[in-house]
């Protein structure tokens, strides 16, 4: 056959679907690779062909569209499973062609098993809710196109294993789940099970997402420098190691770039002719507030180094702050025989 424009295996779309549930999979060509849609392609006389390679096989096979009850079918640019089976797992290819044109892309489809508490190897989307922020909602995802608007499905929501009913601050409202006031205790996996009839059969769609309660923008503040501070003086003798931690708290702020840096005498540490190293670590609280620590280290400090200005700086989308470390040279303890004796008037 003539050369086909092969977009390869599109691993970005690692599609996971639950076993024994309907799945509708759009050919990725029209969504991500070609600049025209299926309708345009169809009216231009192009045909969409589907085939697949079973898991752990190399052989490409046509998809059997003659299964009982039309278990697998194609409608426009969508491949339908009503429902999926475990051995449907494999790489699926959609190819658009006519006598003069050919373009194809493959994508992996994994059919996943779940247990009675909806646990599975499925990668879960994360939905962030702001803590104590007023009413916030999550919506049962990826259910569009499975049934017509005339069909009224039943939707049941679960938190973990438990059906959500009579929960204090979580209220099921059809496709939505409302959180009256989100708290840390609301962290967890939430599942909606959508049940709908089709041609005398009943189908279930299971969708699980992770809710993560994060700091509220109402509570977001500019960075707070915990160290250095006015209570700690870094008193060193020449030759000793100087270690100054810069510890900064950043309240959670969606997508904020949080930065911490040191200046020495107003310059980058690299621009000063001393051997400085800076080690950084990052930790997060339960509400994704961030603490960044940068430890400035001078292995063998000189008396000149102890006269320099060491300033820790921090910035986030909320603002910028800076704090100087109190660094001084340790006054050597007096040696009794000479200094102290002189103090007593001995000669």
């Amino acid at each position: 056959s003539e050369r086909c424009d092969d977009w390869g295996l599109d691993t970005m779309r690692q599609i996971q679907v639950f076993e024994d549930e309907p799945a509708r999979i759009k050919c990725p060509l029209f969504e991500h690779f070609l600049k025209f849609n299926y309708s345009t392609a169809h009216s231009a006389g192009l045909t969409l062909i589907w085939y697949w390679t079973r898991q752990d096989r190399d052989l490409e096979e046509p998809i059997n569209f003659r299964l009982p009850e039309n278990r697998i079918s194609k409608e426009k640019d969508v491949l339908w499973f009503r429902p999926t089976l475990l051995n449907d797992t494999g790489n699926y290819t959609c190819m658009l062609r006519n006598t003069t044109y050919c373009s194809k892309v493959a994508f992996p489809l994994e059919v996943v098993q779940k247990d009675s508490c909806f646990n599975s190897p499925m990668k879960l989307p994360v939905h962030k809710l702001y803590i104590e922020y007023g009413i916030q909602r999550i919506t049962c995802p990826n259910v569009d196109g499975y049934f017509p608007s005339s069909v009224k499905p039943t939707i049941t929501w679960y938190m973990g294993c438990y059906k959500i009913q009579n929960f204090n601050n979580v209220i099921p409202e059809g496709m939505n789940l409302s959180f009256l006031i989100a708290l840390i205790s609301n962290n967890g996996n939430y599942t909606c099970v959508v049940t709908y009839p089709e041609n005398g059969r009943t189908f279930h769609l299971t969708r699980t997402l992770t809710v993560k309660v994060v700091g509220s923008p109402k509570n977001a503040v500019p960075p707070v420098i915990h160290s250095p501070n006015d209570h700690v003086v870094y008193e060193k003798e020449p030759g000793e190691e100087l270690l100054i931690p810069c510890t900064v708290y950043f309240s959670f702020l969606m997508d904020s770039r949080n930065e911490v840096w040191w200046t020495i005498d107003g310059k980058k540490p690299d621009d000063i002719t001393i051997d400085v190293t800076i080690n950084e670590s990052i930790s997060h609280s339960r509400t994704e507030d961030e603490t960044r620590t940068q430890i400035l280290s001078i292995k063998k400090v000189t008396s000149e180094d102890l006269k320099r200005s060491y300033v820790c700086h921090a910035r986030s989308a909320k603002g910028e702050v800076a704090k100087a470390a109190k660094v001084k040279q340790k006054v050597p303890a007096p040696r009794y025989t000479v200094e102290l004796a002189c103090g007593f008037g001995a000669t």
Epitope: S256, R257, P269, D270, V276, I278, E280, A317
Partner: antibody, heavy 117, light 107 residues
């Protein structure tokens, strides 16, 4: 002298992989965040990915998330970008940059990645 | 993501003239905005950081101003070597974003 030298670019088939490297010299590498920025032929600049000085924190542009991985080896003063599932739109000059808090103050000369169909 | 819109797309001026380039952000980026200059076949170079601070080695004819959403790069008297493409970049939020560029060309 502060320098960044990229390597690893080249011609690759669509769907293939490449690993870019960047050798840093003339500064305390572990003290700086580093980034990759790319520029498609005749187009503007596009940020690709960043990594903190310690390597604890990474960020990616949506266009490469799940396909590209940024990493660093502070003992060797080297930055890497592992690029998988390459697409035609990934064709660009890839710049390694030192990303100080206020701006990208040191840039490499760039390495060219061409993804063919 | 924060969208940066630069205007004009192309600016045609003569050496000695004053150039004013604009960058507008889709939401506030505080003063965390940088400007870069790129000449053909070269890597970009940092000109201005934090909206108004000149980077090391940048001539005084380059200046930046603005905060929040509206920023300006001004070149007080154009030198022949200033004709290039200029990009603004916001550093307040992930993802880091660049403007589409302003081409400064000789009239």
């Amino acid at each position: 002298e502060v320098q960044l030298l990229e390597s690893g670019g080249g011609l690759v088939q669509r769907g293939g992989s490449l690993r870019l490297s960047c050798a840093a010299s003339g500064f305390t590498f572990s003290s700086y965040a580093m980034s990759w920025v790319r520029q498609a032929p005749g187009k503007g600049l596009e940020w690709v990915s960043s990594i903190s000085g310690s390597g604890d924190s990474t960020n990616y542009a949506d266009s490469v998330k799940g396909r590209f991985t940024i990493s660093r080896d502070n003992s060797k003063n080297t930055l890497h970008l592992q690029m998988n599932s390459l697409r035609a739109e990934d064709t660009a000059v890839y710049y390694c940059v030192r990303d100080y808090y206020y701006g990208m103050d040191v840039w490499g000369h760039g390495t060219t990645v061409t993804v063919s169909s | 993501e924060i969208v940066l819109t630069q205007s004009p797309a192309t600016l045609s001026l003569s050496p000695g003239e004053r150039a004013t380039l604009s960058c507008r952000a889709s939401q506030s980026v505080n003063s965390y905005l940088a400007w870069y200059q790129q000449k053909p076949g070269q890597a970009p170079r940092l000109l201005i950081y934090d909206a108004s601070n000149r980077a090391t080695g940048i001539p005084a004819r380059f200046s930046g101003s603005g905060s929040g959403t509206d920023f300006t790069l001004t070149i007080s008297s154009l030198e022949p070597e200033d004709f290039a493409v200029y990009y603004c970049q916001q550093r307040s939020y992930w993802p880091i974003t660049f403007g589409q560029g302003t081409r400064l060309e000789i009239k």
